[in-house]
């Protein structure tokens, strides 16, 4: 469930602190409820960037688990189509710390509406 996704995000945050990854990531910091699935997709795609750049087994495994969890939760809700949402590339680029904070916020949005 989404609580496990948050604990994975916390774990990624802890793992990243011991590294120096300077990447900036497309970040949706003001998610509209009607675009939350699209925003989630962008967050997950950018997480893969973190995984790739870190080259770290623990980060890789945690990112993969997080994506598996999110996929399964969202697929159980059926196909959700959203329109008029921003493309990932249109989002503001932010550092990893801000990116992860915004990610936690969107997950909390899913928790509050489930």
């Amino acid at each position: 469930n989404w609580v496990n996704v948050i604990s994975d995000l916390k774990k990624i945050e802890d793992l990243i602190q011991s590294m120096h990854i300077d990447a900036t990531l497309y970040t949706e910091s003001d998610v509209h409820p009607s675009c939350k699935v699209t925003a989630m997709k962008c967050f997950l795609l950018e997480l893969q960037v973190i995984s790739h750049e870190s080259g770290d087994t623990d980060i890789h495994d945690t990112v993969e688990n997080l994506i598996i969890l999110a996929n399964n939760i969202l697929s159980s809700n059926g196909n959700i189509t959203e329109s008029g949402c921003k493309e990932c590339e249109e989002l503001e680029e932010k550092n990893i710390k801000e990116f992860l904070q915004s990610f936690v916020h969107i997950v909390q949005m899913f928790i509050n509406t489930s």
Epitope: K41, L45, H60, D61, T62, I67, S75
Partner: antibody, heavy 122, light 112 residues
Framework: EVQLVESGGGLVQPGGSLRLSCAAS????????MSWVRQAPGKGLEWVAT????????YYPDSVKGRFTISRDNSKNTLYLQMNSLRAEDTAVYYC???????????????WGQGTLVTVSS | DVVMTQSPLSLPVTLGQPASISCRSS???????????LEWYQQRPGQSPRLLIY???NRFSGVPDRFSGSGSGTDFTLKISRVEAEDVGVYYC?????????FGQGTKLEIK
């Protein structure tokens, strides 16, 4: 050439336990997730379990969840499947398979062992 | 759970002729990141399964180019352009977009 060699199969009574092993060689074991897949006699393939590269994350179908445990020892290049509370329907050839994960180009079980037969019968 | 349904279950083919196997999923297997994790495996008689195709249409190394994969969403196809004797066996589609990962029932290809 990538090699995966399963062992530990055999005859076991219903309710009994068995531990399968899969010895990996000719690749960096810790760089890959691993899976177990089984095949009942004359039947199709069934996914049984997957474990992440570091071993922290495991995944199972409901048919084995709570009874089977996948684990690994990266220092020994070995994958395990602990099978408890075995049932007649668990009778199958058990294959271990190397799993390519998405960050490295998509999911797939790209190399398989020869399998080990588990027979659950009284 | 995602149910994978293959057809036909038995496929008699003349050597040198094309063959086609269909695989349908009970729901879309496009994951949230836009990837479709659909593979095809071949199991020759008495042998272990072997990876042919991954991510719908990518041929695994060493797989002859007479094998091709296509499809999207819920409908997928494995095609063999000209069947050879060594192609005899059972072919399985498999989805690992969503846990639990699931195989199709298998299609047995035999020579007429």
């Amino acid at each position: 050439e990538v090699q995966l060699v399963e062992s530990g199969g055999g005859l076991v009574q219903p309710g009994g336990s068995l531990r399968l092993s899969c010895a990996a060689s000719e690749f960096t074991f810790s760089n890959y997730a691993m899976s177990w897949v089984r095949q009942a006699p004359g039947k199709g393939l069934e996914w049984v379990a997957t474990i992440s590269r570091g071993g922290d994350y495991t995944y199972y179908p409901d048919s084995v969840k709570g009874r089977f445990t996948i684990s690994r020892d990266n220092s020994k290049n070995t994958l395990y499947l602990q099978m408890n509370s075995l049932r007649a329907e668990d009778t199958a050839v058990y294959y271990c398979a190397r799993r390519v994960s998405m960050i490295t180009g998509g999911y797939a079980m790209d190399y398989w062992g020869q399998g080990t037969l588990v027979t659950v019968s009284s | 759970d995602v149910v994978m349904t293959q057809s036909p279950l038995s496929l008699p083919v003349t050597l040198g002729q094309p063959a086609s196997i269909s695989c349908r999923s009970s729901q879309s297997i496009v994951d949230i990141t836009g990837n479709t994790y659909l593979e095809w495996y071949q199991q020759r008689p008495g042998q272990s399964p072997r990876l042919l195709i991954y991510k719908v249409f990518n041929r695994f190394s060493g797989v002859p180019d007479r094998f091709s994969g296509s499809g999207s969403g819920t409908d997928f196809t494995l095609k063999i352009s000209r069947v050879e004797a060594e192609d005899v066996g059972v072919y399985y589609c498999f989805q690992d977009s969503f846990v639990p990962y699931t195989f199709g029932q298998g299609t047995k290809l035999e020579i007429k």
